[in-house]
Structure formats: structure tokens, C-alpha cells
């Protein structure tokens, strides 16, 4: 399995390699095969990254930051491969790497520009703050600074608050949107242009349901085909809002096809799940079941939130007893 990095070829013997934080990459370099191979990799023309000559590595003067993180493809050196295998890249590794290769017939120098990106899976959260309702798109660690866009009913919204905190090596970003009193659907997109990776969060509010005590309720939750790819690992969580916080009723993991149910009156239809329909039933309703129910379908590329408001009213029987 090759490390997750891709090469962009640019003129003047210079290539751009894009890697992900904490993953392994290859800095490519090739030469015309010859004997007496000497290979030196340097960073920013100053720091010694890796040296190979006389048939073996010489790492005595290697900069400590590269210790145990670099190696060559030793069996392929004689075929003209001077590429460097680079373990666990960090944002501090970004910059220009120079590969010097000398042989009995020539000396060549290749430059490789390493860019490192971070994109820890974002989340879309629904929060109540006093009487206000907020949708928050957030990403805990991202680099470079992402592009965040909001849409309401598929129409772009210009208002776009961004709360940003920068750490040594990445940004943490929150983008809250006040949706108090709105029945619209909302979509938030976070794009990392360097890694060419996009994540989308979609929020839909369903019409309120009025139910009588002791009845059961069926709440729909079906992914939107635009985002949903059944081949990709995802998680489905049903939760209920109680006094401003959500408690998890049940969840399903696609990787293991495991279903965990925390509420005995909750049921999921296995056959529907196999058809990617995550609608649920809540039996034997009582007054305290009134509230907001949230279905969250999440993968690395999307979060789909569906909100149902359920009003449980006393049955006539119960009312007449009172």
C-alpha cells in the first residue's frame, strides 16, 4: 500500500508532493542508473535529511528531527530510484527538499516541494442556547485554512461567522448559524483545497408530529443519495433532546453492521437498514417523550442531520381521569 500523497509535476526538475499530517509519504527522485551512487536529501538547503553512499546509509550528521523517519528504496537504487520514504509527516516538514544524486557518469539535483494538509473529519452539531437554535459546522484540526460555505434551501448564504483558533500546526474552526424559528433545510460545506477534500453537513427539519400517549411513533431517516455511498463506512445515531442535551437512543455502525439500542421501546427494522433506511419506531409513548429527535448519519465525507419534533399529548382516557 503506497502512502497517501500525490505528485504534481511542475517544470525545472521540481515536483510538488502533498501529504497528510501523521501519514507517510514518498518524495520522488529518479536518475540515470550508474555506479558509485551517492544520494543526499536536504531540507531548505540546510538540514541533512538522509545520506547514502558507498553502498549504505550515513546518518551521523542527520538532523535529529528526521531520526528514524527516513529511508530509501535500497533494492531500487541500482535501477535509478533515489526516492525518499518519509514517515509521519508534520506541518513543520513543509518546505523544499533537494535530492542530490551523483554517479560515475553524472550529478543531478531534483527539488521536491512538500505541502502538508490536515483535515480531521468535521462535524455538524445542532445546539439550543436559551431560546435560540444553532447549527454549528466545526473542524477540530484543519490546514490550510478551509473554505466554509452555507446554503439555505440550496441557496448560498452570505452571512458566515467563523470562530477560529490557531495552534502551532493547524486551525480549529467553528462556524455557527442561527436557525431559530426556521423550517428550512441547511447545508454546510467545508473544503480543504490542498487535499482536494470536501465535507458536507446537511440539516433537515421534518414537520412536527402530534401523538397520543401510549401510541407509537415512526420517525423517518433516509440518506440523500447525493451524499450517501453505501460502500463507505458510516455511523447512524438516533438521539433525543432533553433539557438542552442529547441522549443517545441507539446507533448503528456500517463497518460491523452492529446495532446498539439504549432505549427498550426503540426499534429498528433490520430489513429497512439493509436498504439504507434508518427510520425508527418508538413504542408506548409517554408525555416525557415529547421533544426533538435527531437522526445523524455520518461518514468521513458528510453528516446528514434530520430533526423530528414530537408532541405527546395525554390520551382522552388519561385526561378524563384527571
Amino acid at each position: 500500500i503506497f502512502p497517501l500523497a500525490f505528485f504534481i509535476y511542475v517544470p525545472m526538475n521540481e515536483q510538488i508532493v502533498i501529504g497528510r499530517l501523521d501519514e507517510d509519504i514518498i518524495l520522488p527522485s529518479s536518475f540515470e542508473r550508474g555506479s558509485e551512487v551517492v544520494i543526499h536529501w536536504k531540507y531548505q538547503d540546510s538540514y541533512k535529511v538522509h545520506s547514502y553512499y558507498k553502498g549504505s546509509d550515513h546518518l551521523e550528521s542527520q538532523d535529529p528531527r528526521y531520526a528514524n523517519r527516513t529511508s530509501l528504496f535500497y533494492n531500487e537504487i541500482q535501477n535509478g530510484n533515489a526516492s525518499l520514504f518519509f514517515r509521519r509527516v508534520s506541518l513543520l516538514d513543509e518546505g523544499i527538499y533537494t535530492c542530490y544524486v551523483g554517479t560515475a557518469i553524472q550529478v543531478i539535483t531534483n527539488k521536491v516541494v512538500l505541502k502538508v494538509g490536515v483535515f480531521l473529519t468535521p462535524v455538524m452539531k445542532y445546539e439550543k442556547r436559551n431560546t435560540n437554535s444553532f447549527l454549528i459546522c466545526s473542524v477540530l484540526s484543519v490546514y490550510p485554512r478551509p473554505i466554509i460555505t452555507w446554503k439555505m434551501d440550496n441557496t448560498p448564504i452570505s452571512e458566515n461567522n467563523m470562530e477560529e483558533t490557531g495552534s502551532l500546526d493547524s486551525f480549529s474552526i467553528n462556524s455557527p448559524l442561527n436557525i431559530t424559528g426556521s423550517n428550512s433545510s441547511y447545508e454546510c460545506t467545508i473544503e480543504n483545497s490542498l487535499l482536494k477534500q470536501t465535507w458536507t453537513g446537511r440539516w433537515t427539519m421534518k414537520d412536527g408530529l402530534h401523538k397520543m400517549q401510549s401510541e407509537h411513533v415512526s420517525l423517518s431517516c433516509q440518506p440523500v443519495n447525493d451524499y450517501f455511498s453505501p460502500n463507505q463506512d458510516f455511523k447512524v445515531t438516533w438521539s433525543r433532546m432533553k433539557s438542552g442535551t442529547f441522549s443517545v437512543l441507539a446507533y448503528y455502525l456500517s463497518s460491523s453492521q452492529n446495532t446498539i439500542i439504549n432505549e427498550s421501546r426503540f426499534s429498528w427494522n433490520k430489513e429497512l437498514i439493509n436498504q439504507s433506511d434508518f427510520s425508527m419506531n418508538l413504542m408506548d409513548l409517554n408525555l416525557s417523550d415529547s421533544g426533538e429527535y435527531l437522526c445523524n448519519i455520518s461518514s468521513d465525507e458528510y453528516t446528514l442531520l434530520t430533526i423530528h419534533t414530537v408532541h405527546v399529548e395525554p390520551s382522552q382516557e388519561t385526561a378524563s381521569h384527571n
Epitope: 558509485e36 551517492v38 553502498g55
Partner: antibody, heavy 121, light 106 residues
Framework: QVQLVESGGGVVQPGRSLRLSCAAS????????MHWVRQAPGKGLEWVAI????????YYADSVKGRFTISRDNSKNTLYLQMNSLRAEDTAVYYC??????????????WGQGTLVTVSS | DIQMTQSPSTLSASVGDRVTITCRAS??????LAWYQQKPGKAPKLLIY???SLESGVPSRFSGSGSGTEFTLTISSLQPDDFATYYC????????FGQGTKLEIK
């Protein structure tokens, strides 16, 4: 073609200093390690010092360590040997020589014609 | 330090002869050995590197062999231009020359 031309030799008194230069042409100077090798009159060859292509590594023979300093100016395509505290036994023809590659190998593919240094009172 | 010992110090031979010069290292130097030719008043010239690789432009009558501590330079058929002094040089650890072998006309 590769050309190495040494200069700066001459007669100098013991204890004094001298600076040798080697002007390089016909190749990309900054790609190659460079050496100084000397030969006392009627004697064999003795390696003196090496500097890597980028100036990052410098090594010296025990006989000159602490007294001689090798350096290079890649922008001027020039190699230098600063010789301090000269002794009679430093009398020799000093050759500037180009390494096969960065300097990591340590043998001499091209040589200059040499410059004579005589240390005598 | 690695010492290099060449033998013989002087070798008398005639044009057309096959001659062999030996170089011995005080410790193993793998194949990191070069051979040079030097004529009076001239700079040395590289003949062989890595014990047996012929430098570009050097006549094929010159050949090198050996590894570890024992090395030889062979001239298969001496030519008038070959009478000179020959030096071996180890480059396994820094650099050391042998004391030289003077090849003269018999």
C-alpha cells in the same frame, strides 16, 4: 572541459601563513566535493583535506588538523586552503582535486597542475 | 588510520610485458580503492576506481582487481607511454595513498 588552476604558492617562513586558491571551470562547481592533495619534493602523494559540495562537511589529515582550513565560495567557483603555523615539512606541491561527486566518495577524478609552497627561513 | 603498502617500490619492465603492482591495506577497505598514474612534473591521473572499474578514457590494457585488503593493478601489455609512477589510494575512511611504485624501462 574540467579545469582547475591553483595559485597563491610561494616561499614563506616557518610559523607564517599562506592562502592557496583554486579556480574551477568547465563544470558545475557547487555539485562536487573538492580536495587538497600535496606532494613533497621527490616523495609520494599525501591527502590534505576535503570539503563537500555544499560546504557542510570538512575533513583533514592528522598532520594539518588545527593549522589548515579548507573553504569554498560556490558563487566564485573557487576553493581555498588557509595554511597557518607553517612548518618546513609542509613544503610541497599542493594540488587541488575534484571528487567524483559530492565529496562522500573521496577519490580524485580531476586534478590541477599544482602550486609549490616552500617553507624556509 | 589505514596504512597502504605498495610493492614493489620499483619495477623494471620492457614494452609488451605484462606487469602487476600490488597494494595491501592494513585493514579491510572493501572495494574502496583507486589507482593513479603520475609522470614527472605532472599531476596524477585517475585510472581505476572501486578496485576494478576503469575510468572513462583509460586504455583497456589497465585493469584492477581485489577486495578487502589485497589489490592489484595489471597492465596487460606495456606501452612506452606507461612508464611512470603508480599510486594506490584507499577511500574507505578519509584517504590514504600507498608510497608509490616506479615503473621504469628495463
Amino acid at each position: 572541459q574540467v579545469q582547475l588552476v591553483e595559485s597563491g604558492g610561494g616561499v614563506v617562513q616557518p610559523g607564517r601563513s599562506l592562502r592557496l586558491s583554486c579556480a574551477a571551470s568547465g563544470f558545475t562547481f557547487s555539485d562536487y566535493g573538492m580536495h587538497w592533495v600535496r606532494q613533497a619534493p621527490g616523495k609520494g602523494l599525501e591527502w590534505v583535506a576535503i570539503i563537500w559540495y555544499d560546504g557542510s562537511n570538512k575533513y583533514y589529515a592528522d598532520s594539518v588538523k588545527g593549522r589548515f582550513t579548507i573553504s569554498r565560495d560556490n558563487s566564485k567557483n573557487t576553493l581555498y586552503l588557509q595554511m597557518n603555523s607553517l612548518r618546513a615539512e609542509d613544503t610541497a606541491v599542493y594540488y587541488c582535486a575534484r571528487d567524483r561527486s559530492s565529496g562522500a566518495l573521496g577519490y580524485f577524478q580531476h586534478w590541477g597542475q599544482g602550486t609549490l609552497v616552500t617553507v624556509s627561513s | 588510520d589505514i596504512q597502504m603498502t605498495q610493492s614493489p617500490s620499483t619495477l623494471s619492465a620492457s614494452v609488451g610485458d605484462r606487469v602487476t603492482i600490488t597494494c595491501r591495506a592494513s585493514q579491510s577497505i572493501s572495494s574502496w580503492l583507486a589507482w593513479y598514474q603520475q609522470k614527472p612534473g605532472k599531476a596524477p591521473k585517475l585510472l581505476i576506481y572501486k578496485a576494478s572499474s576503469l575510468e572513462s578514457g583509460v586504455p583497456s590494457r589497465f585493469s584492477g582487481s581485489g577486495s578487502g585488503t589485497e589489490f592489484t593493478l595489471t597492465i596487460s601489455s606495456l606501452q612506452p607511454d606507461d612508464f611512470a609512477t603508480y599510486y594506490c589510494q584507499q577511500y574507505n575512511s578519509y584517504s590514504t595513498f600507498g608510497q608509490g611504485t616506479k615503473l621504469e624501462i628495463k
